[in-house]
Interface confidence: low
C-alpha cells in the first residue's frame, strides 16, 4: 500500500503529494496545460516525474525544492512550501512522524500495528490510511504526548517512544485567531479567565494542579502564560484554574462570527432531515440504478464520484452527465455488469456494490419507506398455510379436520354465538365460513361447524415453510440517526 | 437511551425486553438464536431462579404490546464463570423467527472493533427527558479505543480488555439505566454483528464519560460452548 506522503525529504525530488499552491498562495498551472505558460516539463516529456494535475513537483532537482508553473501570467513559476518529512526527528507531538524507530522509551520492542497479539487493539491500519501505521514503527494517531506503540511485552500494553525533536522550526499550523473559530484549536488570544470567572493557572506551573499539558509537551500549541488554549482537541479553549477545587474549565471566547458562542452551543448541528430513498436492488446491468447505497460487497465505503482521493479517475459527473454520479452512491456509468464504485480504501481501487438484482415484479422507482414485510404471526397470510398458531391465516379453507363444512361467522344457525362475529372482531378476517383463529387458540384455526351436535372444531391448515431470515439482517431498514 | 432517536419499528429485531414475571421491563437483551438470549449478568442479580424472568420479543412499545409480540418464559440462566458482566438465558420454547424477530450475529472469537467504528445501541431505558420514552430508541456511537478511554480525563484506567467503550466525548448520547444487557451492534459488510453488551457507565451521557460494554468477541467461545452443551 503506497502511503501518499504530504511531506518532502531533502529537496523533494521524490515528493508526490497534492499541494497545488505556491508559497505565495498562487494556484499552480496544470503540468499538461500550455496556458498561461508553455512548460518545459510536462507529463509527456517527463513521464516518471509524477507531473499529475497541478501538484507541486521537482522534476529538475532544484535545490530549493518542489515548484510549479503558476496560473498568474506575470509569474512563470514559483516554489511551494512543503513540510519536511519527520523521518529522523519529530515536530510538535509527532503527529506526522514518519520515521522507523520501533522501540519504546524503556527499550521494549513495538508490536506491529496490523497485529492483534499480544495486545488486541482498535488502531487497524486499513481503517486509518492517513495515519501511516506502518510495520511496528512508533506513531501518534491519537493526540498522545508523542509517538508511541503497543509493546511486545504482554504485561505492558503500550508505551511512549523517545523520538528526538527536530531542530528546524515546526511547520505553520495555518491561520491563528484572536476569536473563537470551530473548536478554537487555533485560538491565540489573551483571555485567561474561565466561564465561571476563575483565573487560569499558568501552563508551565504545576500548582495547584499537576498536569501534562505543558509547553514542553505541546510545543506547537502556544501554551503561553495562562491564556486559554485548546491543545488536546476539547470542545473549546480551556485552562486549568487557580482554584484548587476546580481542576479545569472552558473559557468564554468571543466568536469570530461576532455573536458570542457559549460552550453549550459548540456541539455540531445535525444535517437537514434528508432521508434518501434506499433502492435496494437494480434492473439489468444497473445503469438505471439511482438508489443511495454506498457500500461495496466487502463492506467498504464508496469514494465520491467528484473526488479524486484516494483514487484518481475519469468517471466524473462532468464526463458522465447522465449516469447519476451523485455523492458516493453506487452507479454503473460504463456499462459494467452491475453498480460499482471507487472505494475509500487506498489499497482497493474499485469494487462492485452490495446490491441484489431486482426480481421481475419489483418496481424500479422505490417509494419510501423501503420496508419489505414478510408474513409472520401478525401479518395476514392469504396462502393456504399458516405461520405459528395461524392467528394471521387468511386462506380459504372452510372444512374441519373431520371434513364438516364450516358455519358462516355471520350466521346464527345451527349455532347461536355472539363472541366471534364480524361485528365484534372486525379485524380478525371473519369472512364467509373460512377457518380462522380470532382468539389465538394454540390449536390453530377453527370454525363453528354446520353439524348441530358439534359447536366448533379445528381445521387442517398446514404450517407454511418458515421463511429464512439471516442473522443480523433486519427486514426493516434501521433509521441510523446520528448520535448527536 | 439518552439522545439518539426513536427507532423504526422492528428495525432491530434481535432486541429483547427482559421482564419480571409480572411484566415490568428492567433490562435489555439480545436474541442470538431461537432459544438463546444474551444479557448482562448484573441484570440477574435480583433472583437466581429462571421463573423470575420472562422475555418479550418483537416489541416496539414498552407497555402496549402489539398482538404479534412473543412472550416466552426463561428455563435456565448461565452466568459467565469468571464473573464478567455477561450471561445467557435459555428460553423455555424457541422463538418463532419472523420478520420482526431475527437473531443478531455473533462476532468471530477475539475480533477487535476498530477505533472510531460507528455502532448502534438500542433499548427502552432511561431517556433523561430526551424524547421517545416508552418506545424503542437507538443511537449511533463511535467505539473508542481502550487506550484513549482509560485516559485520566475519561474513565481513568477502569476499562478492562474484556470491555469496550463507545460514545461521544462531548456527551449527550448514551445508554442508560434500563438499557443494560442490551445490544451494541456494528454493521460489517452486509449484516449487524453483536459486538457489545450494555454494561456500565459513570452516569449517563456525561461529557468525557463514554459508556462501557462487555466485549462479546472475548466470550464467543464460552457462548457457543454453553449453547452446544445445553
Amino acid at each position: 500500500k503506497v502511503y501518499l506522503s504530504e511531506c518532502k525529504t531533502g529537496n523533494g525530488k521524490n515528493y508526490r503529494g497534492t499541494m497545488s499552491k505556491t508559497k505565495n498562495g498562487i494556484t499552480c498551472q496544470k503540468w499538461s496545460s500550455t496556458s498561461p505558460h508553455r512548460p518545459r516539463f510536462s507529463p509527456a516529456t517527463h513521464p516518471s516525474e509524477g507531473l499529475e494535475e497541478n501538484y507541486c513537483r521537482n522534476p529538475d532537482n532544484d535545490p530549493q525544492g518542489p515548484w510549479c508553473y503558476t496560473t498568474d501570467p506575470e509569474k512563470r513559476y514559483d516554489y511551494c512550501d512543503i513540510l519536511e518529512c519527520e523521518e529522523e526527528c519529530m515536530h510538535c507531538s509527532g503527529e506526522n512522524y514518519d520515521g522507523k524507530i520501533s522501540k519504546t522509551m524503556s527499550g521494549l520492542e513495538c508490536q506491529a500495528w496490523d497485529s492483534q497479539s499480544p495486545h488486541a487493539h482498535g488502531y487497524i491500519p486499513s481503517k486509518f490510511p492517513n495515519k501511516n501505521l506502518k510495520k511496528n514503527y512508533c506513531r501518534n494517531p491519537d493526540r498522545e504526548l508523542r509517538p508511541w506503540c503497543f509493546t511486545t511485552d504482554p504485561n505492558k500494553r503500550w508505551e511512549l517512544c523517545d523520538i528526538p525533536r527536530c531542530t528546524t522550526p515546526p511547520p505553520s499550523s495555518g491561520p491563528t485567531y484572536q476569536c473563537l473559530k470551530g473548536t478554537g484549536e487555533n485560538y491565540r488570544g489573551n483571555v485567561a479567565v474561565t466561564v465561571s470567572g476563575h483565573t487560569c493557572q499558568h501552563w508551565s506551573a504545576q500548582t495547584p494542579h499537576t498536569h501534562n499539558r505543558t509547553p514542553e509537551n505541546f510545543p506547537c500549541k502556544n501554551l503561553d502564560e495562562n491564556y486559554c488554549r485548546n491543545p488536546d482537541g476539547k470542545r473549546a479553549p480551556w485552562c486549568h484554574t487557580t482554584n484548587s477545587q476546580v481542576r479545569w474549565e472552558y473559557c468564554k471566547i468571543p466568536s469570530c462570527d461576532s455573536s458570542p458562542v457559549s460552550t453549550e452551543q459548540l456541539a455540531p448541528t445535525a444535517p437537514p432531515e434528508l432521508t434518501p430513498v434506499v433502492q435496494d436492488c437494480y434492473h439489468g446491468d444497473g445503469q438505471s440504478y439511482r438508489g443511495t447505497s454506498s457500500t461495496t460487497t466487502t463492506g467498504k465505503k464508496c469514494q465520491s464520484w467528484s473526488s479524486m482521493t484516494p483514487h484518481r479517475h475519469q468517471k466524473t459527473p462532468e464526463n458522465y452527465p447522465n449516469a447519476g454520479l451523485t455523492m458516493n452512491y453506487c452507479r454503473n456509468p460504463d456499462a459494467d455488469k452491475g453498480p460499482w464504485c471507487f472505494t475509500t480504501d487506498p489499497s482497493v481501487r474499485w469494487e462492485y456494490c452490495n446490491l441484489k438484482k431486482c426480481s421481475g415484479t419489483e418496481a424500479s422507482v422505490v417509494a419510501p419507506p423501503p420496508v419489505v414485510l414478510l408474513p409472520d404471526v401478525e401479518t395476514p397470510s392469504e396462502e393456504d398455510c399458516m405461520f405459528g398458531n395461524g392467528k394471521g391465516y387468511r386462506g380459504k379453507r372452510a372444512t374441519t379436520v373431520t371434513g364438516t363444512p364450516c358455519q358462516d361467522w355471520a350466521a346464527q344457525e345451527p349455532h347461536r354465538h355472539s363472541i366471534f362475529t364480524p361485528e365484534t372482531n372486525p379485524r380478525a378476517g371473519l369472512e364467509k365460513n373460512y377457518c380462522r383463529n380470532p382468539d389465538g387458540d394454540v390449536g390453530g384455526p377453527w370454525c363453528y361447524t354446520t353439524n348441530p351436535r358439534k359447536l366448533y372444531d379445528y381445521c387442517d391448515v398446514p404450517q407454511c415453510a418458515a421463511p429464512s431470515f439471516d442473522c443480523g439482517k433486519p427486514q426493516v431498514e434501521p433509521k441510523k440517526c446520528p448520535g448527536r | 437511551v439518552v439522545g439518539g432517536c426513536v427507532a423504526h419499528p422492528h428495525s432491530w429485531p434481535w432486541q429483547v425486553s427482559l421482564r419480571t414475571r409480572f411484566g415490568m421491563h428492567f433490562c435489555g437483551g439480545t436474541l442470538i438464536s431461537p432459544e438463546w438470549v444474551l444479557t448482562a449478568a448484573h441484570c440477574l442479580e435480583k433472583s437466581p431462579r429462571p421463573s423470575s424472568y420472562k422475555v418479550i420479543l418483537g416489541a416496539h412499545q414498552e407497555v402496549n404490546l402489539e398482538p404479534h409480540v412473543q412472550e416466552i418464559e426463561v428455563s435456565r440462566l448461565f452466568l459467565e464463570p469468571t464473573r464478567k458482566d455477561i450471561a445467557l438465558l435459555k428460553l423455555s420454547s424457541p422463538a418463532v423467527i419472523t420478520d420482526k424477530v431475527i437473531p443478531a450475529c455473533l462476532p468471530s472469537p477475539n475480533y477487535v472493533v476498530a477505533d472510531r467504528t460507528e455502532c448502534f445501541i438500542t433499548g427502552w431505558g432511561e431517556t433523561q427527558g430526551t424524547f421517545g420514552a416508552g418506545l424503542l430508541k437507538e443511537a449511533q456511537l463511535p467505539v473508542i479505543e481502550n487506550k484513549v478511554c482509560n485516559r485520566y480525563e475519561f474513565l481513568n484506567g477502569r476499562v478492562q480488555s474484556t470491555e469496550l467503550c463507545a460514545g461521544h466525548l462531548a456527551g449527550g448520547t448514551d445508554s442508560c439505566q434500563g438499557d443494560s444487557g442490551g445490544p451494541l451492534v456494528c454493521f460489517e459488510k452486509d449484516k449487524y454483528i453483536l459486538q457489545g453488551v450494555t454494561s456500565w457507565g459513570l452516569g449517563c451521557a456525561r461529557p468525557n464519560k463514554p459508556g462501557v460494554y462487555v466485549r462479546v468477541s472475548r466470550f464467543v467461545t464460552w457462548i457457543e460452548g454453553v449453547m452446544r452443551n445445553n
Epitope: P141, T183, M308, T344 | E145
Partner: nanobody
C-alpha cells in the same frame, strides 16, 4: 463532526449575479471534494458544481459558462460565483463536503457533511 455554513443567497433579478460561500468548521483533518447542489421545490436535488482538493472542477451542463466554483483550502471554504442568473436557477443551494475529521481524540473518521442551505430567488 464537521459543520458547513452557506451564505450569500438572496433575491436577484434575471441576468444578475450572486456569490455563495460555504465555510467548513470543526476538527477537520482534510477535505477531499467540496460540491454545490441545489433543490427547487418539487424537484430532486441536483449537483451544480464540484471541486476537488487539487482544484479539478466539474459543472452541470445547465450552468457551464455562467457559474464558477472556487475554493480556498487554507480557509476550508468553497465559493460559487453565479452570473447571468435565470429564473430556473432559483432554488435552495446546499454545500456538501467529504473528507476526514479528527474527533476529540484525533483519530480520523470520514465525514460527508451538508450545510443547511441558502435560498436563491431569481425574479424575471
Amino acid at each position: 463532526q464537521v459543520q458547513l455554513v452557506e451564505t450569500g443567497g438572496g433575491l436577484v433579478q434575471a441576468g444578475g449575479s450572486l456569490r455563495l460561500s460555504c465555510a467548513a468548521s470543526g476538527n477537520i483533518f482534510s477535505i477531499n471534494a467540496m460540491d454545490w447542489y441545489r433543490q427547487a421545490p418539487g424537484k430532486e436535488r441536483e449537483l451544480v458544481a464540484a471541486i476537488t482538493s487539487g482544484g479539478t472542477t466539474n459543472y452541470a451542463d445547465s450552468v457551464k459558462g455562467r457559474f464558477t466554483i472556487s475554493r480556498d483550502n487554507a480557509k476550508d471554504t468553497v465559493y460559487l460565483q453565479m452570473n447571468s442568473l435565470k429564473p430556473e436557477d432559483a432554488a435552495f443551494y446546499y454545500c456538501n463536503a467529504d473528507g476526514y475529521y479528527s474527533d476529540y481524540d484525533k483519530n480520523l473518521a470520514e465525514f460527508n457533511s451538508w450545510g443547511q442551505g441558502t435560498q436563491v430567488t431569481v425574479s424575471s
